[in-house]
Amino acid sequence: LIIGFGISGRHSITVTTVASAGNIGEDGILSCTFEPDIKLSDIVIQWLKEGVLGLVHEFKEGKDELSEQDEMFRGRTAVFADQVIVGNASLRLKNVQLTDAGTYKCYIITSKGKGNANLEYKTGAFSMPEVNVDYNASSETLRCEAPRWFPQPTVVWASQVDQGANFSEVSNTSFELNSENVTMKVVSVLYNVTINNTYSCMIENDIAKATGDIKVTESEIKRRSHLQLLNSKAS
């Protein structure tokens, strides 16, 4: 969490941002809140990106002002206009690109004063893994697949019964480049699995950590997946 205060001139206002990560090809949110003002027409929101010649987004007098928007953000940004009055300056970024990563500044002017706060925005690809029994294999085998990751993640297998065991000798992981030549499909195979055990396939890079669990018994198979972003720090 980054909390910024205003500088010079009028009183300072508190602006708060939260570091976040964007999944390339999907829409992302750059979070920013501020002390609200009673008049929408008195609020100016500017989003800037370090090292960029134009603005990321500007909202003033109750509407978008995009005359000085940088070309790399053209047609891809929006604020939540109906929530600005209550202090939400968050920015929606459409079709996140790898090059959107960097340091952003949320700069606010209201009748109470000015304030700004920076946020770090990471970009990459992350997806939920799915673990299945590979019935085509000669021995009992599990196959963990996740369609989109970038940068290349690490894959670690774990088991509930053999806690602390190292499965690197009995697993094989491959990374297959997807058609857009950036993200990769992750496939990891675990051999010699035993029945009545829960296995976890953990995929992690510097942006996200995802886990796919599978419990195999003689009567049923239970699956569970979850994904966690690693860098959500508020400022």
């Epitope: 090292g51 960029v52 010649l53 134009g54 960097g102």
Partner: antibody
Framework: EVQLLESGGGLVQPGGSLRLSCAAS????????MSWVRQAPGKGLEWVSA????????YYADSVKGRFTISRDNSKNTLYLQMNSLRAEDTAVYYC???????????????WGQGTLVTVSS | DIQMTQSPSSLSASVGDRVTITCRAS??????LAWLQQKPGKAPKLLIY???SLESGVPSRFSGSGSGTDFTLTISSLQPEDFATYYC?????????FGQGTKVEIK
């Protein structure tokens, strides 16, 4: 201490190509946009091209659009200018300069290289 | 692209003189204007940015003013080391444009 050092200039025939480099040191290179500026012999300054800190945006003067390509390698702290289809009027000293860090807030063109001479002649 | 027109293109002045150079933009560039000084055979040097902000290390005899389309560089008391060519430069759009330059010579 901030330093910018251009290289790659020289004599080239019309229609030829040349690649200029600018090695940067003394500052966080990826935090700044960078520009190329040229100066023909006895003439004024002409902005040529700029690139954002992360390399996601590139900008060109109309006179070089479609012929020149600006790029950067932040891992090497180096800025490049690939110049193709060179013409006699491209003859100039080419400078790299540190451009803006934050829109509307920071100085720009506060540091310059010493320049590298490009001569286009048959 | 925004065009920048400087005047005069050259001027002769004496040490101690007050010198004023003007720069006009073809359309508004807000306050996104810089002034640079160049001496023969040297790279340009930034003097003023954001129309009126003095770059660190630049003597206080240099000052800038204006906004929108009309800008002025003033040297309050010309010194021997100030004889050089001065350029205005806009950065209010993605392109950066320089004026054609003003050469300040010794009278």
């Amino acid at each position: 201490e901030v330093q910018l050092l251009e290289s790659g200039g020289g004599l080239v025939q019309p229609g030829g190509s040349l690649r200029l480099s600018c090695a940067a040191s003394g500052f966080t290179f990826s935090s700044y946009a960078m520009s190329w500026v040229r100066q023909a012999p006895g003439k004024g300054l002409e902005w040529v091209s700029a690139i954002s800190g992360g390399g996601g945006s590139t900008y060109y003067a109309d006179s070089v659009k479609g012929r020149f390509t600006i790029s950067r390698d932040n891992s090497k702290n180096t800025l490049y200018l690939q110049m193709n289809s060179l013409r006699a009027e491209d003859t100039a000293v080419y400078y790299c300069a540190r451009d803006i860090q934050w829109y509307g807030e920071s100085t720009l063109f506060d540091y310059w290289g010493q320049g590298t001479l490009v001569t286009v002649s048959s | 692209d925004i065009q920048m027109t400087q005047s005069p293109s050259s001027l002769s002045a004496s040490v101690g003189d007050r010198v004023t150079i003007t720069c006009r933009a073809s359309q508004s560039t807000r306050s996104w204007l810089a002034w640079l000084q160049q001496k023969p055979g040297k790279a340009p040097k930034l003097l003023i940015y954001k129309a009126s902000s003095l770059e660190s290390g630049v003597p206080s005899r240099f000052s800038g003013s204006g906004s929108g389309t009309d800008f002025t560089l003033t040297i309050s008391s010309l010194q021997p080391e100030d004889f050089a060519t001065y350029y205005c430069q806009q950065y209010g759009s993605y392109s950066r444009t320089f004026g054609q330059g003003t050469k300040v010579e010794i009278k």
